[in-house]
């Protein structure tokens, strides 16, 4: 039965304007069942770090160890798969870093990064200095294990030099990699020493070896590709948002709710209210009022702005997000102070979030 009584009757999901909220591609860590996994929170100057999994707070237990900026999962199981986030709370702000964990029989880790192609990788040699092939940018080759979601584009690079200029060819699982080996083929950009595969599928999984050679020698480097398939997921809300806020009577304030959802989300801002002097209905459920929801006539539903607040505006504000899969909600409290008792910061306004494509 419902956990609240709505003061205003609203349908769960009215028609939405054509916006797309989407998870920006997080790094993917892949572990085999039974393995241990350690991830370092890639945020700087973190005073306090909190962790979430699929939007739910993550605490230490007999298999999960949280030490400083490190998360350790011992004896991983498929249930450990999901979207993780670490939030670094600082004195003035907070920042969140997202990553995927995929516990699967495939061995792989990391994610492909979209390097900016640059001809700086194409090194010309003095024609007199004969030289066997050598790597010119090993930093771009450090990540050997790449795990990417299906339908993404993958780029492997082997920037090299030599004299005469070496040639590059690619092997898949130790055999010549031919265009007909995959639907849609692949691209080789010799100028950038790269192999590009668009819209990867599970059959693209395997070892990819670049062989760079000239008449004075041959070098090679192998990457492992894992293609991670996906399941529909309910909305995920950024940890720590909306954030508690305080302002004086007559002040303005904004609450921000950052939503991650592949599917169209419906956002509602809800507040506990009183009706006929009571906070609860005859059924014992609290009265709630929908202040704002995403829809045709609603701009930037991720932000709730309150202007010229009164003491009656104080209380809990809930950001409730639903899609066709399920729901998620997080709340924050507004404290309204008398005008003479100004807080440290009169207005606590969080910057409007980016829309992630």
């Amino acid at each position: 039965r419902p956990s609240f009584s709505l003061v205003e009757d609203t349908t769960l999901e009215p028609e939405e304007p054509p916006t797309k909220y989407q998870i920006s591609q997080p790094e993917v860590y892949v572990a085999a069942p039974g393995e241990s996994l350690e991830v370092r929170c890639l945020l700087k100057d973190a005073a306090v770090i909190s962790w979430t999994k699929d939007g739910v707070h993550l605490g230490p237990n007999n298999r999960t160890v949280l030490i400083g900026e490190y998360l350790q999962i011992k004896g991983a199981t498929p249930r450990d798969s999901g979207l993780y986030a670490c939030t670094a709370s600082r004195t003035v702000d907070s920042e969140t870093w997202y990553f995927m964990v995929n516990v699967t029989d495939a061995i792989s880790s990391g994610d492909d990064e979209d390097d900016t192609d640059g001809a700086e990788d194409f090194v010309s040699e003095n024609s007199n200095n004969k030289r066997a092939p050598y790597w010119t940018n090993t930093e771009k080759m450090e990540k050997r294990l790449h795990a990417v979601p299906a339908a993404n584009t993958v780029k492997f690079r082997c920037p090299a030099g030599g004299n005469p200029m070496p040639t590059m060819r690619w092997l898949k699982n130790g055999k010549e990699f031919k265009q007909e080996h995959r639907i849609g083929g692949y691209k080789v950009r010799n100028q950038h020493w790269s192999l590009i595969m668009e819209s990867v599928v599970p059959s693209d999984k395997g070892n990819y070896t670049c062989v760079v050679e000239n008449e004075y020698g041959s070098i090679n480097h192998t990457y492992h590709l894992d293609v991670v398939e996906r399941s529909p997921h309910r909305p995920i809300l950024q940890a720590g948002l909306p954030a508690n806020a305080s302002t004086v009577v007559g002040g303005d304030v904004e609450f921000v709710c950052k939503v991650y959802s592949d599917a169209q989300p419906h956002i509602q801002w809800i507040k506990h209210v009183e009706k006929n002097g009571s906070k609860y209905g005859p059924d014992g459920l609290p009265y709630l009022k929908v202040l704002k929801h995403s829809g045709i006539n609603s701009s930037n539903a991720e932000v709730l702005a309150l202007f010229n607040v009164t003491e009656a505006d104080a209380g809990e504000y809930i950001c409730k997000v639903s899609n066709y899969i399920g729901q998620a909600n997080q709340s924050a409290w507004l404290t309204v102070l008398p005008k003479q008792q100004a807080p440290g910061r009169e207005k606590e306004i969080t910057a409007s979030p980016d829309y992630l494509e």
Epitope: P2, F4, L12, A151, S231, P232, R234, Q264, G326
Partner: antibody, heavy 114, light 107 residues
Framework: QAQLVQSGAEVKKPGASVKVSCKAS????????MHWVRQAPGQGLEWIGL????????SYNQKFRGRATLTVDTSTSTAYMELSSLRSEDTAVYYC???????WGQGTLVTVSS | DIQMTQSPSSLSASVGDRVTITCKAS??????VAWYQQKPGKSPKLLMF???YRYTGVPSRFSGSGSGTDFTLTISSLQPEDFATYYC?????????FGQGTKLEIK
């Protein structure tokens, strides 16, 4: 691995009501919407509505609003779909499906005949 | 309500063929489209969601594309087990509507 098991076939008279159950196992029942979809013999799929077991929120296809009632019993991880004022054109297989339509029940045939 | 119009309504093809089924929404649904496969007497099975995401365990010969109002499901090389009825569905706004189905038969 989630699994949805539905109640057995029903034969009803016009004007009567039917209540179909859908028992979930293997996943967090309260974390996903439960959809109800029907399919008349030889026809396509038609969405009836959804319920979110976490708080009881419902959304109905306007076509079924007032006749269909979706409820859940979280203690048994069971969802229910009740359809009242049955008519012959309600004869169909009724399916429950988890949030992302990634898991479906086996279907329940409801026959409305005088 | 958003109407989903599928074409063709039926299709005959042979094993090994490349097959494309299209679905047109009556208004823009961004990429909020799913595809299902259904065999006689069985429940539908999810193939694709969010237009182009292949659901876990679905063979790579299935692919989906499109955004806005026009969507396609492609089977790159038909296998015997692929002969079934296919439905598109929009999961953009309620009521979540389905296409009328495409029956894929052996030629």
């Amino acid at each position: 691995q989630a699994q949805l098991v539905q109640s057995g076939a029903e034969v009803k008279k016009p004007g009567a009501s039917v209540k179909v159950s859908c028992k979930a196992s293997g996943s967090t029942f309260t974390s996903y919407n439960m959809h109800w979809v029907r399919q008349a013999p030889g026809q396509g799929l038609e969405w009836i509505g959804l319920i979110y077991p976490g708080n009881g929120d419902t959304s109905y296809n306007q076509k079924f609003r007032g006749r269909a009632t979706l409820t859940v019993d979280t203690s048994t991880s069971t969802a229910y779909m009740e359809l009242s004022s049955l008519r012959s054109e309600d004869t169909a297989v009724y399916y429950c499906a988890r949030g992302g339509f990634d898991y479906w029940g086996q279907g329940t045939l409801v026959t409305v005949s005088s | 309500d958003i109407q989903m119009t599928q074409s063709p309504s039926s299709l005959s093809a042979s094993v090994g063929d490349r097959v494309t089924i299209t679905c047109k929404a009556s208004q823009g649904v961004t990429t909020n489209v799913a595809w299902y496969q259904q065999k006689p007497g069985k429940s539908p099975k999810l193939l694709m969601f969010s237009a182009s995401y292949r659901y876990t365990g679905v063979p790579s010969r299935f692919s989906g594309s499109g955004s806005g109002t026009d969507f396609t499901l492609t089977i790159s090389s038909l296998q015997p087990e692929d002969f079934a009825t296919y439905y598109c569905q929009q999961h953009y706004s309620t009521p979540y509507t389905f296409g009328q189905g495409t029956k894929l038969e052996i030629k």
